[in-house]
């Protein structure tokens, strides 16, 4: 039998993440991740991490928090690297096709690996009480751990849709798993969800050459409200569109626009045009680098930060032991597992409705002939 | 800071070859897709090519002009981006920048958009 | 493939003078990028999917538009402004952009 994943989440990044508690083999798991269509998870640093983090720390898989877990990802020895005690992996590396990243900003080593040039060493993320991430431990490719993490790469993904009346939101993304929330889903997501009067909806993330929508969607709301509000997407009455500081903390619903007092909701064009052509007051708190995404309605445009990338795995054509998992983004029956990540959106969001990109480089060029950064 | 730097470029005779290249950095190249496009001298923007990233397959697109004489390539290893030019005609004569295609999020939607332009490199094809 | 016609072709404006572009698409299409040169530079996307500005573009500018007629608005002309605007669909291949429109100051 081969679990479900227990957790995952996807990032605007593009970058989605599964957490797996399945006793097994480094090489199983590697398996495991190519059949669902990703490969064993790099945790290199910055976004990644705390992604990473925040699926551990959702919650602790079987034993209930009561041991420490050992999960396989794509961190390894090989067989003619030595041990370098100076180097924040200790010559382990990321088995991935990113070309350099800073591996300064990572995880402490919970025993230091043991001395050698010649063996090929894996590398094991440990968890404390299965859900608090101590650091890396080196162990034996051959020996099983608790579980592993695998990632997938995606070039565009569906933003969350907004409620509005739904209730009973369920979120089926491709390879097996189910939530009640998620920022960012990937091609072939389905959502379905109960308008008012129980009836039924269900919408599908499609990808195409614009980019990527939920098919079936009016609007960006599930199910329109009855009203003229909306508060963190989900359908609000006047009296609760106040914030702590007495601010405007709505937007307006589908045929609303805000009215000149600023705090009112007034069909489209008796009030005054709002930014970006939408209702939204300039309250609006931004989509932040570190906090998460509000309901999105200004835009955000997604810049990754550098080490952040897809692993490209060496497929090994002898795996005959794992059943077929369907791959993300097939056309496959879909079954449960929970779910739960907040995206970051490495955007700041400009009282303009524009964005100022948020970007870590580490690297430049003195050359003239370069991108020219200003122009978005 | 995204930068893409574009070189290759040259004179060229007709029915001559030529590979143009694009070192990119500053972003997770492997995981956006990328064009080239090109722009004749005092004349409008012209689409060349795509070649999207590893997650689709590396799939590649292009223009009716330039199909079978043209091939878009990459490699991720090296954050690097290739347009193979053969059978150059005097009507490829141009600049050819190397793009970036973004993602851009807004309402419930996600929207490619070129956003990152490089300075381009100039092809000129003359006998 | 889709055929993108910008008018006018080339068109001068005066400091805090409304401007309005246009492209008209042979077949309809989903959405409409556009992008802003000057001379001797690279392009730089200034509207995308119909109407929301890149960053750093003036909140002056504007973006609507569907079918196949679309249009970039100035609501008052600055110095700056002045460069060619192409517009561009990817809602089919091959990908088009329009010819141009080059503003002026007058």
């Known amino acids: 039998e081969h679990p479900t994943a227990d957790r995952a989440g996807c990032s605007a990044s593009g970058a989605c993440y599964s957490l797996h508690h399945a006793t097994m083999k480094r090489q199983a798991a590697e398996e495991a991740c190519i059949l669902r269509g990703g490969a064993l998870s790099t945790v290199r640093a910055g976004a990644e991490l705390r992604a990473v983090l925040a699926l551990l720390r959702a919650g602790p898989g079987p034993g209930g928090g009561s041991k420490d877990l050992l999960f396989w990802v794509a961190l390894e020895r090989r067989r003619s690297h030595c041990t370098l005690e100076n180097e924040p992996l200790r010559g382990f590396s990321w088995l991935s096709s990113d070309p350099g990243g800073l591996e300064s900003d990572t995880l402490q080593w919970v025993e230091e690996p043991q001395r050698s040039c010649t063996a090929r060493r894996c590398a094991v993320l440990q968890a404390t009480g299965g859900v608090e991430p101590a650091g890396w431990k080196e162990m034996r490719c051959h020996l099983r751990a608790n579980g592993y993490l695998c990632k997938y790469q995606f070039e565009v993904l569906c933003p969350a849709p907004r409620p509005g009346a739904a209730s009973n939101l369920s979120y089926r993304a491709p390879f097996q798993l189910h939530s009640a929330a998620l920022d960012f889903s990937p091609p072939g997501t389905e959502v379905s969800a109960l308008c008012r009067g129980q009836l039924p909806i269900s919408v599908t993330c499609i990808a195409d050459e614009i980019g990527a929508r939920w098919d079936k969607l009016s609007g960006d709301v599930l199910c329109p409200c009855p009203g003229r509000y909306l508060r963190a997407g989900k359908c609000a009455e006047l009296p609760n569109c106040l914030d702590d500081l007495g601010g405007f903390a709505c937007e307006c619903a589908t045929g609303f626009e805000l009215g000149k007092d600023g705090r009112s909701c007034v069909t489209s064009g008796e009030g005054q045009p709002t930014l970006g052509g939408t209702g939204v007051p300039t309250r609006r708190p931004p989509a932040t680098a570190t906090s998460p995404v509000p309901q999105r309605t200004w835009p955000i445009r997604v810049d990754e930060k550098l080490g952040e990338t897809p692993l490209v795995p060496e497929q090994d054509n002898s795996v005959t032991s794992i059943p077929e998992i369907p791959r993300w983004g097939s056309q496959s029956t879909m079954s449960t597992l929970q779910m739960s990540l907040q995206a970051e959106s490495k955007a700041t969001i400009t009282p303009s409705g524009s964005v100022i990109s948020k970007f870590n480089s580490t690297t430049s060029s003195a050359t003239p002939q370069a991108f020219d950064s200003s122009s978005a | 800071e995204v930068q893409g730097v574009e070189s290759g470029g040259g004179l060229v005779q007709p029915k001559g070859s030529l590979k143009l290249s694009c070192a990119a950095s500053?972003?997770?190249?492997?995981?956006?897709?990328m064009h080239w496009v090109c722009q004749a001298p005092g004349k409008g923007l012209e689409w060349v090519a795509r070649?999207?990233?590893?997650?689709?397959?590396?799939?590649?697109y292009y223009a009716d002009s330039v199909k079978d004489r043209f091939t878009i390539s990459r490699d991720d290893s090296q954050s690097m981006l290739y347009l193979q030019m053969n059978n150059l005609k005097t009507e490829d004569t141009a600049m050819y920048y190397c793009?970036?295609?973004?993602?851009?999020?807004?309402?419930?939607?996600?929207?490619?958009?070129?956003?990152?332009w490089g300075q381009g490199t100039s092809v000129t094809v003359s006998s | 493939e889709i055929v993108l016609t910008q008018s006018p072709a080339i068109m001068s404006a005066s400091p805090g003078e409304k401007v309005t572009i246009t492209c008209s698409a042979s077949?309809?299409?989903?959405?409409m990028h556009w992008f802003q040169q000057k001379p001797g530079t690279s392009p730089k996307l200034w509207i995308y999917?119909?109407?929301n500005l890149a960053s750093g573009v003036p909140a002056r500018f504007s973006g609507s538009g569907s079918g196949t007629s679309y249009s970039l608005t100035i609501s008052r002309m600055e110095a700056e402004d002045a460069a060619t605007y192409y517009c561009?669909?990817?809602?089919?291949?091959?990908?088009?952009f329009g010819a141009g429109t080059k503003l002026e100051l007058k």
């Open positions: 070649i999207r990233s590893k997650s689709n397959n590396y799939a590649t």
């Open positions: 077949s309809s299409v989903s959405y």
């Open positions: 999917s119909t109407s």
């Open positions: 500053g972003f997770t190249f492997n995981t956006y897709a």
């Open positions: 793009v970036r295609e973004g993602v851009y999020y807004y309402g419930s939607s996600g929207y490619y958009a070129m956003d990152y």
């Open positions: 561009q669909q990817r809602s089919s291949y091959p990908l088009t």
